[in-house]
């Protein structure tokens, strides 16, 4: 259950997580399986621990094999196992299957290929990108932070990239390469200005003093998956971070639904043990993409206590 | 959603044992720790030990371990917590309860309703 | 074992007014998680690793401190906060509760 596959190619940095978690605090003990022999977390080792991570540096591969890692939490040593498996580098071009990472789908609109396992070394800009061995040249093409950006994405596009980069461990450099397929989704999309479908304009939403309140900003962008996009909502013209009211919360993350073929964003505004002043605030829902900005306000009225009986 | 579900009240004479079981629902039952925590009447909280349903290891509170027997049924989703050698003193509301995820410690999320056990001659 | 001790043991205060709850610890601890019990009820967690709002909790209730002190702080105190409050190590084994604090109308 608490297995994890990893993989890498000899003479490359390979460092694995264990795939039991834990809090910064506790300690992780790792082992050769094979051999129940302790992994040292001294760093000059080619092979060494280091917390929830074993690193190979550079991997070889007669590194193949099952590592054990125990996580000494308070009350159990909780058990992972990564199988990690080291291959020769190929002659030739082509990357094997069992050396892909999962394949990413992309459209006209969106277009990021992220480079796997990349948040696990200590690296730097730039990253270097490769399709089926050809070095990724071209304003089409953008390497932003740990992704790739392919403007335009045509069919043609499809294939096979690696993302190369260099991972730093006390002033030696490794060199880590992964690579994943790249299919491109023939989608007949669209964009055209936000249509906010709730809540209505210059709407008047009821609540009760002292209770909890939600209110949500829905909109729809287009059809198909939208490049820029986004909902919030706005107290008295500001940003909810800006205002200061904690009772006050955006939802994290906006909820992305298909509303007949429709892309569409939700924001929730929560709004807890509403006060008499919440209901002098203005609250607009504001709906933006590449077309421009809609708004939409929104008041909030006592509910009267008699709406109860009726 | 989750559910931790515990049998009713006992009433038990000193010297006796108390099996108490705590029915888990809404999560993958071996995935948890389960953990037992009393609480006698007007007092505190008390931690009494804990078990992985996975590979049935236990924890227990050095005060109760020659005591208690904790315990885990896979196939029912069940754990139990067992009580012997029962004194007035362990008269007290027994809970069951888990953390939110499991690897981080981050508090008991999710607790069952407590089973009072009295324990009187 | 780390021993954690709650004051005051019983604070009397009117709803709107600001509650602080302290915890004092025998050992230092990285962390710290609090509960609100009310009568008849299990405990429920509200603070946990020190800091962070457990789910569906209001956001009056806030927590801070490190090593040996640490504070559970109501920033207006509603009528449903009355209620006892722990709070619970996880740092060394066994896990220990601090003895609770009455939060009591004035």
């Known amino acids: 259950k608490f297995s994890k596959q990893s993989w890498g190619l000899e003479n490359e940095a390979l460092i694995v997580r264990c795939p039991r978690q834990g809090k910064p605090s506790y300690t992780v003990d790792w082992y050769y399986s094979q051999t129940n022999k302790s992994i040292p977390t001294q760093e000059r080792n080619r092979v060494f621990a280091s917390g929830q991570l074993l690193k190979f540096l550079p991997a070889a591969v007669a590194d193949s094999g099952i590592y054990t890692c125990i996580v000494r939490s308070p009350t159990f040593n909780r058990t992972g196992y990564a199988n990690v498996t080291i291959y020769k580098k190929q002659s030739d071009c082509n990357v094997p299957d069992y050396l892909m990472y999962s394949t990413v789908s992309g459209s006209e609109k969106n277009s990021k290929i992220y480079c796997p396992t990349i948040d696990l070394y200590n690296w730097t800009a730039p990253l270097e990108w490769f399709k089926n061995c050809q070095a990724l040249q071209g304003s089409r093409y953008r390497a932003h932070k740990s992704f790739l950006v392919i403007d335009n994405v045509m069919t043609e596009d499809a294939g096979d990239y690696t993302c190369k980069f260099i991972h730093n461990e006390n002033g030696a450099n490794y060199s880590v390469t992964a690579t994943r397929s790249f299919t491109v989704k023939d989608e007949q999309g669209f964009s055209l200005f936000p249509v906010i479908g709730a809540p209505a304009q210059n709407e008047i939403k009821e609540v009760e003093i002292g209770k909890n309140a939600n209110l949500t900003c829905s909109a729809c962008f287009g059809k198909g998956t939208q490049f820029l996009a986004a909902v919030l909502w706005q107290l008295n013209g500001t940003k909810i971070t800006d205002f200061g009211e904690p009772r006050i919360q955006q939802e994290e993350g906006q909820n992305q639904s298909f509303s007949n073929g429709l892309a569409c964003l939700d924001m929730v505004l929560r709004i807890a043990d509403v006060k008499e002043e919440d209901l002098l605030l203005q609250y607009d829902c504001l709906a933006l993409n590449l077309h421009g900005l809609r708004r939409h306000t929104v008041r909030l009225s006592r509910k009267n206590p008699i709406d109860h009986h009726s | 959603q989750v559910q931790l579900v515990q049998s009713g009240a006992e009433v038990k004479k000193p010297g006796a044992s108390v099996k108490v079981s705590c029915k888990a629902s809404?999560?993958?039952?071996?995935?948890?720790?389960l953990h037992w925590v009393r609480q006698a009447p007007g007092q505190g909280l008390e931690w009494m030990g804990t078990i992985d349903p996975e590979t049935g290891d236990t924890v227990y509170n050095q005060k109760f371990k020659a005591r208690v027997t904790m315990t885990a049924d896979k196939s029912t989703s069940t754990a139990y917590m067992e009580l012997s050698s029962l004194r007035s003193e362990d008269t007290a509301v027994y809970y069951c309860?888990?953390?939110?995820?499991?690897?981080?410690?981050?508090?008991?999320?999710?607790w069952g309703q407590g089973t009072l056990v009295t324990v009187s001659s | 074992e780390i021993v954690l001790t709650q004051s005051p043991a019983t604070l009397s205060l009117s709803p709107g007014e600001r509650a602080t709850l302290s915890c004092s610890v025998s050992?230092?601890?990285?962390?710290m998680h609090w509960y609100q019990q009310k009568p008849g009820q299990a405990p429920r967690l509200l603070i946990y690793?020190?800091?962070k709002l457990a789910s569906g909790i209001p956001a009056r209730f806030s927590g801070s401190g490190s090593g040996t002190d640490f504070t559970l702080t109501i920033s207006s105190l509603e009528p449903e906060d009355f209620a006892v409050y722990y709070c619970?190590?996880?740092?060394?084994?066994?896990?220990?509760f601090g003895g609770g604090t009455k939060v009591e109308i004035k």
């Open positions: 619970q190590q996880w740092n060394s084994s066994p896990l220990t």
């Open positions: 050992s230092s601890v990285s962390y």
């Open positions: 809404g999560y993958t039952f071996t995935d948890y720790e």
């Open positions: 309860t888990r953390a939110f995820y499991n690897d981080y410690d981050e508090g008991f999320a999710y």
């Open positions: 690793d020190t800091s």
